[in-house]
C-alpha cells in the first residue's frame, strides 16, 4: 500500500533571483484532486492553498508581493489527496538581490580576446562580504562562486568562442542575499574564421533567464511560465 504520493514540482516565476521589494510567485504542481497544498520555508509552514475545485486544478501559486531578506531561503511544498500526503518537493532556493551595494566587474586582459587566451574576471565590492558570484547571461547561467576579502578572481582559463557573452557579478552576504548586479561586461572571443560567424551567444539556451530577471527589476512584471536554473540552484546547496 502506498504511504505517500509522488513529490510535486516547485519553481519561482519569473525567477528565483528576486530584487528586494519586488514580487515573486512560487508555484507548486502536484496532482489533480489535491485538496490542500502547503508551502514550507526553512522547515516552517509558510502558506496554505486549498484548490477549488480540486479535481480540476493541479497547480497552485503562492504570491509574494514584497520580497525581503526575511523571505529569502529554501522553500519546499507538499500536497494532500484525501488523508494522504505527498513526498516533499525538491528545495527551491529563493534569493533576494539588490541588497546594499553594487560590485564592479572587470576582465583581464580585456573584453576582446583570442580563442586560447587566458581570461580572468575580477569582482570587487568594498562592503562586508567575502563571497562573490559570476553569472553569464542565458538560461544556462554558468554561475561561478569566488571568495576574497573585497575582491574575487574568476579565472576562465584558455577561452573558446563558447565563453562569448555578457557577464555580471554579485556580492553575496549569505547564500540567499545578494548585492545589486554589477554593470555588464561583454566578452568577445574571436577564433578560427569559421567560428566567427554571428552565432547566438548561447545557442543551447535561447531563452534568456537574465532578461526575465531584468524585467522583474525594471518593471515588476510577471511572466507566466517556469524558468529553471539548475546550475545556480545547485550552487546554492
Amino acid at each position: 500500500q502506498q504511504q505517500t504520493l509522488p513529490k510535486p514540482f516547485i519553481w519561482a516565476e519569473p525567477h528565483f533571483m528576486v530584487p528586494k521589494e519586488k514580487q515573486v510567485t512560487i508555484c507548486c504542481q502536484g496532482n489533480y484532486g489535491a485538496v490542500e497544498y502547503q508551502l514550507h520555508f526553512e522547515g516552517s509552514l509558510f502558506a496554505v492553498d486549498r484548490p477549488k475545485p480540486p479535481e480540476r486544478i493541479n497547480k497552485v501559486k503562492f504570491y509574494i508581493p514584497d520580497m525581503n531578506s526575511r523571505m529569502a531561503g529554501q522553500y519546499s511544498c507538499i500536497y494532500r489527496v484525501g488523508e494522504l500526503w505527498s513526498e516533499p518537493s525538491n528545495l527551491l532556493d529563493l534569493v533576494v538581490t539588490e541588497m546594499y551595494d553594487t560590485p564592479t566587474l572587470s576582465v583581464h586582459p580585456g573584453p576582446e580576446v583570442i580563442s586560447g587566451e587566458k581570461v580572468t574576471f575580477y569582482c570587487r565590492l568594498d562592503t562586508a562580504t567575502s563571497m562573490f558570484l559570476l553569472l553569464k547571461e542565458g538560461r544556462s547561467s554558468h554561475v561561478q562562486r569566488g571568495y576574497g576579502k573585497v575582491q574575487a578572481e574568476f579565472p576562465l582559463g584558455p577561452v573558446t568562442t563558447a565563453h562569448r557573452g555578457t557577464y555580471r557579478c554579485f556580492g553575496s552576504y549569505n547564500n540567499h542575499a545578494w548585492s545589486f548586479p554589477s554593470e555588464p561586461v561583454k566578452l568577445l572571443v574571436t577564433g578560427d574564421i569559421e567560428n566567427t560567424s554571428l552565432a547566438p551567444e548561447d545557442p543551447t539556451f535561447p531563452a534568456d533567464t537574465w532578461g526575465t530577471y531584468l524585467l522583474t527589476t525594471e518593471t515588476g512584471l510577471q511572466k507566466d511560465h517556469a524558468l529553471w536554473d539548475h546550475t545556480a540552484q545547485n550552487l546554492l546547496r
Partner: nanobody
Framework: EVQLVESGGGEVQPGGSLRLSCAAS????????MGWFRQAPGKEREFVAA???????YYAESVKGRFTISRDNAKNTVYLQMSSLRAEDTAVYYC????????????????????WGQGTLVTVKP
C-alpha cells in the same frame, strides 16, 4: 499604504470570550489576505489564525475549535472571536495583512505579511 488598527482587547476570566476587530484603511482590503498573531511576555511572536481573500481559514493547533477568524469586506474589517479562553492565551494580539494577494492563499508565516497593526492586549486571569 495600508493601516491596521486593532480593538477589542481587555481583561477576561478563564473560560470567557472576547472578540477582536482589525479595521483596515484603504480600498485594497478585498485583495488582502489577513492574519492574527500574538506575542506573550518574554516569548516570540506566534501565528494564531489566518484567512484568505476567498474566506479559507487556517488555525494554530493551540486555538483550533476555540477561536474563529472571519472578515467583512464591506466594513474592511477582520475579526477574531475567542472563546474558552485560558491563561496561556494572554498576549498582545497583532493583526497583519498581505497586500495584494491572489486566489486562495492563506499565509501562516509572519515573514509573508507586509503590513502590521500596533496590537491589542488580551489578559486572561481569575
Amino acid at each position: 499604504e495600508v493601516q491596521l488598527v486593532e480593538s477589542g482587547g481587555g481583561e477576561v476570566q478563564p473560560g470567557g470570550s472576547l472578540r477582536l476587530s482589525c479595521a483596515a484603511s484603504g480600498r485594497t482590503f478585498a485583495s488582502a489576505a489577513m492574519g492574527w498573531f500574538r506575542q506573550a511576555p518574554g516569548k516570540e511572536r506566534e501565528f494564531v489564525a489566518a484567512i484568505s481573500r476567498s474566506d479559507d481559514t487556517y488555525y494554530a493547533e493551540s486555538v483550533k475549535g476555540r477561536f474563529t477568524i472571519s472578515r467583512d469586506n464591506a466594513k474592511n474589517t477582520v475579526y477574531l472571536q475567542m472563546s474558552s479562553l485560558r491563561a496561556e492565551d494572554t498576549a498582545v494580539y497583532y493583526c497583519a495583512a498581505v497586500v495584494p494577494t491572489y486566489g486562495n492563499t492563506i499565509y501562516v508565516h509572519s515573514a509573508a505579511y507586509n503590513y502590521w497593526g500596533q496590537g491589542t492586549l488580551v489578559t486572561v486571569k481569575p
